[in-house]
Interface confidence: medium
C-alpha cells in the first residue's frame, strides 16, 4: 500500500520528502530501483538505477535542485531534499521503491503532498479618499505571499468583521509564482472612521493587520497574530 | 499523454515461434521498468516478463528459458521472443511501464493476441 505523507515548506527554503524503510533496513545500491516523480503529471524529479550515473531523463525544473543521499539509500532511507522551493513544487510527489531481486517487486511506495507557503507583505492601507460626499474609500495592499489570501475589513472599534459585499478583492499571480493582493473597500461617510485590514494566510495560519483612522493619517501598528480573524487580536506581535 | 501499443500476434502451431512488439511514447522509456503481461480466457491477468532499463530481467517460470524480453531504449520499443510456444501459452499480452503508474499497472494497450493451436 502506498503511505501517505503530507509536508509543509516556505517558498525559497530546502524541504525534505520523507521516505524510508524501517530503522534497520540494508539495500543494495545495485539492486534497488528509486522513482522520484509527481503523482499528476508524472514528471520525473530524480531516480536511482543500479550501474547508471545519467540523470538525464529527470525535469530541468528539478535538475540540480532535488537530491537523494547514497549514504541514506543503503539505510533504506529514499528520502528527496528538495532545495530552493517555488510555488510550482506544491504538488503530490510520489516515491517508489523496486527491488531487482525480488523479482522488481514494489519495497516502498510514499506520496508526500508538498504544501508551499510565503509571508505576505506588511499589508499597507492607503488614506481614505472621497469618490463622493457620501463614501469613503480605502485601498489595502499586500504582496509577494503564498497561497492564495484571504482578506478581511475590521471595524477596529469592536473587532467586528465587515460586510464583505463592501470590498473588491482582485488577486495577482507576479513573476515569482507568488500573490500579491489589492482590496478596496467602499463605506458610507461617518465622523469617524477606525477600520483595519486583515491580509490571512491559512496555510502559515497567520493574520497580517494594519488599521486607519479618518482624521489620523497615521495608521495603527501593523500586527501579526497566529489566531483566525474572529479571535481579535489576543497573542498578537507587535511590528516595528 | 501516455500510449503503449502491442503488435506481433497471431495464430502459430504449438512448438512455433511470435515476436511480440510494444511501442511505447509518452513516457521516459530508457528508465521505467516495463513489463509483459497476458490474460488467457476466463483467468487473471499473469506477469510473464521484467526488464529494467539496463536490460536486467526476470520471468515467470511458466516461461523461463522459452521467452526471451529485450527493449530498444533508442526507438522506445519493447520486445517480447516466444519459442516452443504451448497452447497454455494462449492469451492477449498486453505492456506495461512500471514506474509511470506507481508499481501498479493502469496503462495498458489494447494488447495483442496470441493463440496457439495443437
Known amino acids: 500500500d502506498t503511505q501517505e505523507k503530507e509536508v509543509r515548506a516556505m517558498v525559497g527554503s530546502d524541504v525534505e520528502l520523507s521516505c524510508a524503510c524501517p530503522e534497520g533496513s540494508r539495500f543494495d545500491l545495485n539492486d534497488v530501483y528509486v522513482y522520484w516523480q509527481t503523482s499528476e503529471s508524472k514528471t520525473v524529479v530524480t531516480y536511482h538505477i543500479p550501474q547508471n550515473s545519467s540523470l538525464e531523463n529527470v525535469d530541468s525544473r528539478y535538475r540540480n535542485r532535488a537530491l537523494m543521499s547514497p549514504a541514506g539509500m543503503l539505510r533504506g532511507d529514499f528520502s528527496l531534499r528538495l532545495f530552493n522551493v517555488t510555488p510550482q513544487d506544491e504538488q503530490k510527489f510520489h516515491c517508489l521503491v523496486l527491488s531487482q531481486s525480488l523479482g522488481f517487486q514494489e519495497v516502498l511506495s510514499v506520496e508526500v503532498t508538498l504544501h508551499v507557503a510565503a509571508n505576505f507583505s506588511v499589508p499597507v492601507v492607503s488614506a481614505p479618499h472621497s469618490p463622493s460626499q457620501d463614501e469613503l474609500t480605502f485601498t489595502c495592499t499586500s504582496i509577494n505571499g503564498y497561497p492564495r489570501p484571504n482578506v478581511y475589513w475590521i471595524n477596529k472599534t469592536d473587532n467586528s468583521l465587515l460586510d464583505q459585499a463592501l470590498q473588491n478583492d482582485t488577486v495577482f499571480l507576479n513573476m515569482r509564482g507568488l500573490y500579491d493582493v489589492v482590496s478596496v473597500l467602499r463605506i458610507a461617510r461617518t465622523p469617524s472612521v477606525n477600520i483595519g485590514c486583515c491580509i490571512e494566510n491559512v496555510l502559515l495560519q497567520q493574520n497580517l493587520t494594519v488599521g486607519s483612522q479618518t482624521g489620523n493619517d497615521i495608521g495603527e501598528r501593523d500586527k501579526i497574530t497566529e489566531n483566525p480573524v474572529s479571535t481579535g487580536e489576543k497573542n498578537a506581535a507587535t511590528w516595528s | 499523454e501516455v500510449q503503449l501499443v502491442e503488435s506481433g500476434g497471431g495464430l502459430v502451431q504449438a512448438g512455433g515461434s511470435l515476436r511480440l512488439s510494444c511501442a511505447a511514447s509518452?513516457?521516459?522509456?530508457?528508465?521505467?521498468?516495463m513489463d509483459w503481461y497476458r490474460q488467457a480466457p476466463g483467468k487473471e491477468r499473469e506477469l510473464v516478463a521484467t526488464?529494467?532499463?539496463?536490460?536486467?530481467?526476470n520471468y515467470a517460470d511458466s516461461v523461463k528459458g522459452r521467452f526471451i524480453v529485450s527493449r530498444d531504449n533508442a526507438k522506445n520499443i519493447l520486445y517480447l521472443q516466444m519459442n516452443s510456444l504451448k497452447p497454455d501459452d494462449t492469451a492477449v499480452y498486453y505492456c506495461?511501464?512500471?514506474?509511470?503508474?506507481?508499481?501498479?499497472?493502469?496503462?495498458w494497450g489494447q494488447g495483442t493476441q496470441v493463440t496457439v493451436s495443437s
Open positions: 509518452g513516457i521516459a522509456f530508457s528508465i521505467d521498468i
Open positions: 506495461n511501464a512500471r514506474r509511470l503508474i506507481y508499481g501498479r499497472t493502469v496503462y
Open positions: 526488464i529494467s532499463g539496463g536490460g536486467s530481467t
